[in-house]
Structures are given as structure tokens and as C-alpha cells.
Amino acid sequence: TPEVWVQVRMEATELSSFTIRCGFLGSGSISLVTVSWGGPNGAGGTTLAVLHPERGIRQWAPARQARWETQSSISLILEGSGASSPCANTTFCCKFASFPEGSWEACGSLPPSSDPGLSAPPTPAPILRAD
């Protein structure tokens, strides 16, 4: 059955800069990816980026660069300065809308006591919601 994985990494060069990578492990075709922080999208989380395979990418500060890595994975770099910058325990969530199954969402945060520039390999995170 479909799963979503989320990986959060702090950049070694900029300690307040984060890279979020998310992927979808499923057979459906992806219609939309939404990345949020502070909780799931639509449940208290704030949208950082929306990526559509055909219609392009929209992103909101502090998101700096959102892009497709593969047909089923994306990455997002966050600016690390200013009042709206993330902190080490910030939760990031990725929701993949997969046709025709629906939405599959998982969340992750920086691994505890992780060194800058290092993180665990991506593993499937608990799926919060499948509509």
C-alpha cells in the first residue's frame, strides 16, 4: 500500500537552513504535493510549497527553492533567517495527492542530536491520513 517518507536535514554551511525531502512509494500518478510546517496541511500547518506536475511550483517564505527530484520525490530548501525561520524541533509534513487513491501524508522533523549536514536515510514515516 502507498507510503510517504520525509527526511529533514540541517545544512552544514548554514546552520539555520533546512532541506526537506519527501517521496511517495505507491503506484498512482501524483497530482499534487503540498509541503507544510507546524503540522499537517489543513490541520494547523502552514503551507510552504505546492508542486504540481504540470502547472508548476508555488512557494512561500521562508521556502527558498522547491523542486522535483524524481517523478515521485521532491525537495525543499528553507531560508534560515528572520522571525519565520524554522527551529530544530519544527515538524514538516508532505502530502502527496495520488490519482486515484487520494491523499497520503507523513511528517518528520530533524533527527534528535543530529550533526549538521547529516541525517538518517529516508524511511517511511507514519501515514497520518489517507483519504
Epitope: 499537517p40 489543513g42 495527492a97 486515484p100 489517507a130
Partner: antibody, heavy 122, light 106 residues
């Protein structure tokens, strides 16, 4: 108010085709997928297929591949299902249902049409 | 395809009685959805993503389960709850429904 208005009952001959409609109102048509379900008299529910109303992608239950064809007309906010080579086994009520919205987490198939009854007999 | 087996097929309950309907999947699913249907009407979304009540569904209903075993429970049966309930999975294609449980009021 969200409404899905399905076309009226059909009585058709074996071997013929029928095209039923499902007109949506009260929401942005292309924000939601459309889902089609078959229910034989006194029987349970069967998923026929789903169509993405914005880019017209379709996904079918293998059982209905070649039997059902799903299309949409965005200009009239209407979804269509055509059934071909009809037999008595196709006599049923067919429902359209508003499926998943891709912009937020939302319950699936939250609104259903009233159903179109199809009777196949000579 | 993933066959969903509901039990019982038909049951009667007295007002105030606790009711549990089960849905067993042939293979593991992430979530289960439940629909209510009354004679001559369209199905209605009742419980989604295993345990979330759809809008307007009374709080006496609840849903639970994981893997291959799911259930819908009514804490205290009321006359308006008499209907047929269907479970549905959309974790794998084709999406499948259970055969239904017809719940009657005594």
C-alpha cells in the same frame, strides 16, 4: 449548496449503449475528482472508476474496462459515463460521487448523486 | 483484488443496545471508510479514514481498526440508525466495498 444531478432513468435494448450525465453545482468542478459506482438491485456497491476533472486522467476497475468510458465537460461542470454493449448484467443504479479534493485533506466521496437507473431488456 | 468481508450480514438491535459491525480485509489496508445507505437513497459517507465521523454523523458512532480488521460501533442504537452499512478500502486498486451489513431495529 453542493449538488450532483444525474440524468433520468434509461430503458435500453441489449447490445445498445447508454450515456448518463452528472451535473455538478455549488463548488468548483475541477477541484474534485468524480467517482462512479454501480449498485445492482438488492446488491452491494462496486467501484467503476474515477476521473480527474482537471486533466481528464481516468482510472478504471479492470472489470469495467471496455464497458464504461468516463469523460467530463468542464464548461458545463458535467461528468459523463457511457456504458456499451449492454446486457442484463448491466441493469443497475449508477451513482456519481464527488471524490477527493487535492488542495486540502478532505473526506472522500462526500456528496453523491441521486443515481441513474438503467434497465436492459428487450 | 482486496475482498472485504462484513459481518454479520444482517442483524437486529434494540434501542439503546450497543452494536458492532466488523469488516475484514483479505490483505492489509491503511484506512477504512464506511458508508450508510437507506432504502431508495444514495449512500452517505459516514466514517472516513477509519475513525473520523463525517459531518452530521451522531457522536454515538465510532470507528476503529488497523491492518485487516476494522469495525464500526454504535454505542446506543437508535431507530434512525437502521440502514445498510458498507466498508470501503482505497489502499489498493481496484477500490472495493464490503458486501454490506443490514442493521434493523427490534
Amino acid at each position: 449548496e453542493v449538488q450532483l444531478q444525474e440524468s433520468g432513468a434509461e430503458h435500453v435494448m441489449p447490445g445498445a449503449s447508454v450515456k448518463m450525465s452528472c451535473k455538478a453545482a455549488g463548488y468548483t468542478f475541477t477541484d474534485y475528482w468524480m467517482y462512479w459506482v454501480k449498485q445492482r438491485p438488492g446488491q452491494g456497491l462496486e467501484w467503476i472508476g474515477t476521473i480527474d476533472t482537471s486533466d481528464h486522467k481516468t482510472s478504471y476497475n479492470q472489470k469495467f474496462r471496455g464497458k464504461a468510458t468516463l469523460t467530463v465537460d468542464e464548461s458545463s461542470s458535467t461528468a459523463y459515463m457511457q456504458l456499451s454493449s449492454l446486457t442484463s448484467e448491466d441493469s443497475a443504479v449508477y451513482y456519481c460521487a464527488r471524490d477527493f479534493i487535492i488542495t486540502v485533506n478532505y473526506p472522500v466521496v462526500d456528496y453523491w448523486g441521486q443515481g441513474t437507473s438503467v434497465t436492459v431488456s428487450s | 483484488q482486496n475482498v472485504l468481508t462484513q459481518s454479520p450480514a444482517i442483524m437486529s438491535a434494540s434501542p439503546g443496545e450497543k452494536v458492532t459491525i466488523t469488516c475484514s480485509a483479505g490483505s492489509s489496508v491503511n484506512y477504512m471508510h464506511w458508508f450508510q445507505q437507506k432504502p431508495g437513497t444514495s449512500p452517505k459517507l459516514w466514517i472516513y479514514s477509519t475513525s473520523n465521523l463525517a459531518s452530521g454523523v451522531p457522536a454515538r458512532f465510532s470507528g476503529s481498526g488497523s491492518g485487516t480488521s476494522y469495525s464500526l460501533t454504535i454505542s446506543r442504537m437508535e431507530a434512525e440508525d437502521a440502514a445498510t452499512y458498507y466498508c470501503q478500502q482505497r489502499s489498493s486498486l481496484p477500490f472495493t466495498f464490503g458486501s454490506g451489513t443490514k442493521l434493523e431495529i427490534k
